[in-house]
């Protein structure tokens, strides 16, 4: 062929049109082409209908083609693998009717911000789905219902703050779940179902250790041998499990699986027998501290917000222990609570009202007659608007495991050093690859309004620690990509004093505690 390289390997006719500065499909490709490489061209838009004459096409690589639009028309009845990674797609094309035999779909490192409910409809043969490095914030609940054969799912390095409870329902073949480096703060009760998941990657999320994390804590305890940290250049089969990599963001990186859960409702408190799937509260040794707590019955379907607890769970008392977006039945009680010495509370916080702009109503009065405060859609006139001060952070290369123990990962990333072997088809970066440049992590969404009154504290504090979340991915030329954490605009009444050394404030939350 005058433009592309054609080679025959066994029964496969492979056509390589990579890096040819193509703006469209070259004419006169062999009709019996089975594998077509169109990587690193300048296609911008591409129509799958142009490939209909190639009836034996099983694999199509369209990665790094500056694609902003993929037109899905016609049918490619035997296409099994489609690589759309490293493009500029802002929406996932509806591929089901065009590609009914698709088994591997890679849309990593695009610009997807959301997925429609029927995004995967018709993709009943799909086994591997890679959505790493996009800008997804939420997922529709039935997203994966059309793909019951799914084995590998990567949602790593997105902006996910929550997951639908039934996301994994029916996925009996799922063996690898990559959720690392997102903005997840909890896992909904029952999320993992009763199916054993051999490989889970959950590190790099701001897990919020409060009473809602108990289901996840127990799952981690039960599956400690199946929780891993991805390391560049290491085959999945050679990785060592590390359940301690899943850490509480609001308590000095304490492992979630060890979270004591003190002050949380026990099965007898409210008679909700499946509150934590019968997962018992565990005792923690340490000095006893007298604490007041609110006994809370959590509605199982309530929408929650990551800022329901904005200081360390180690206080384990008080009404901010419960997520303020819920509508709990409350009963104020006093009881002996045991804490390790290092978690002894050093201030008391009483909330008369706390309102989140995302939630319809919120009741957090620590008396039997709760006060209900209405949502504040806009900042009140007397409020002080606060932006977190971004602190410069050095991005670290992040990566994910190969999609199966024997096959290389579809979208590769740079090895940490030139000498580290990388199990991918791409060359490792040469010694001259530039080091990552420090980039300030700038938070971008969501906006959260908080109004708080009657706060009693020895010292007012203001914390602006931002969690460095960065993503350095490499092509044949190194392109740094920054995965930015959510922006937080804390708006509280009253005047402020500034301090950075209170360990009980949520590190991602800018808190003003009025005198």
């Amino acid at each position: 062929h005058p433009i592309c390289e054609v080679s025959k390997v066994a029964s496969h006719l492979e056509v390589n049109c990579d890096k040819r500065n193509l703006t469209a499909l070259p004419p006169d490709l062999p009709k019996d082409t089975t594998i077509l490489h169109l990587s690193e061209n300048l296609l911008y838009t591409f129509s799958l209908a142009t490939l209909m004459p190639y009836t034996r096409l099983t694999q199509l690589n369209l990665d790094r083609c500056e694609l902003t639009k993929l037109q899905v028309d016609g049918t490619l009845p035997v296409l099994g693998t489609l690589d759309l990674s490293h493009n500029q797609l802002q929406s996932l094309p509806l591929l089901g009717q065009t590609l009914p035999a698709l088994t591997v779909l890679d849309v990593s490192f695009n610009r997807l911000t959301s997925l429609p409910l029927g995004a995967l409809r018709g993709l009943g043969e799909l086994q591997e789905l890679y959505l790493k490095g996009n800008e997804l914030k939420t997922l529709p609940p039935g997203l994966l219902t059309p793909t019951p054969k799914l084995e590998k799912l990567s949602l790593a390095n997105n902006n996910l703050t929550e997951l639908p409870a039934g996301l994994l329902n029916g996925l009996e073949n799922l063996d690898t779940l990559l959720l690392q480096e997102n903005s997840l703060y909890t896992i909904p009760k029952g999320f993992f179902g009763s199916h054993l998941l051999p490989f889970a990657f959950l590190h790099g999320n701001p897990w919020l250790c409060n009473c809602e994390i108990l289901y996840f804590r127990r799952w981690l305890q039960d599956n400690a041998e199946n929780v891993y940290v991805w390391k560049q250049g290491v085959d999945v089969k050679a990785m060592t499990s590390n359940v301690a990599s899943v850490q509480c963001d609001n308590s000095d990186k304490f492992p979630v699986y060890k979270y004591p859960g003190k002050g949380c409702p026990t099965l007898g408190d409210e008679g909700d027998t499946d509150l934590y799937d019968y997962y018992p509260e565990e005792d923690t040794e340490g000095d006893k501290v007298r604490a007041t707590r609110t006994v809370v019955k959590f509605p199982t379907k309530a929408h929650t917000t990551p800022w329901g607890l904005f200081y360390s769970w180690s206080t384990a008392s008080l009404d901010s222990q419960m997520p303020s977006s819920l509508h709990p039945t409350q009963e104020s009680t006093k009881e002996q609570t045991t804490f390790p010495p290092r978690w002894t509370p050093n201030f008391t916080l009483h909330m008369e009202s706390i309102t989140f702009s995302k939630t319809p109503k919120s009741t957090t009065e620590p008396t039997p007659s709760p006060t209900t405060s209405e949502p504040v859609p806009e900042p009140a006139p007397n409020m002080t608007t606060l932006e977190p001060t971004p602190s410069p952070t050095t991005p670290e290369p992040t990566s994910e495991p190969a999609p199966s123990p024997t096959t290389p990962e579809p979208t590769s990333e740079p090895a940490p050093s030139p000498t580290t072997p990388e199990p991918t088809s791409e060359p490792a970066p040469s010694p001259t690859t530039p080091e990552p440049t420090p980039i300030p992590t700038i938070a971008t969404s969501p906006t959260i309004l908080v109004s708080a009154t009657s706060l009693i504290t020895p010292k007012s504090t203001f914390l602006t620690t931002t969690k460095p979340v960065s993503l350095l991915e490499s092509t044949k030329k190194t392109i740094p990509e920054l995965d930015q954490p959510p922006k937080l605009r804390g708006v509280l009444q009253g005047h402020l004093e500034s301090s950075r050394n209170d360990p009980f404030l949520h590190p991602d939350f800018c808190c003003l505690l009025p005198l």
Epitope: D222, N223, N226, M239
Partner: nanobody, 126 residues
Amino acid sequence: EVQLVESGGGLVQPGGSLRLSCAASGFTFSSSAMTWVRQAPGKGLEWVSAINSGGSGTRYADSVKGRFTISRDNAKNTLYLQMNSLKPEDTAVYYCAKRRDGQNWYPGISYESMYRGQGTQVTVSS
């Protein structure tokens, strides 16, 4: 020292049922994921089922899905495999297995390297 002792095998007619047990000692059973594997005459080890340490997560080979049920009793340090609707092709020596410390568990790994008991023979024949 890790010890795994299987029992409950025997001769059964097609369509019949058996319940295998595995008594474990020498390690913290309640913290360990466990696996059943089997070896048919003249064949290699085949993964059958696995269960996580708390018993809340299970996984089955396609060939036994819907017929076999894995379970455990951590108070008794015992692993079970309930086998229903048995077929002649289920005939094999059944082993309970535990991966070694630091060993990666995955359906398809080399089961020879795992801790295993002496096995219990299951024969399905009319």
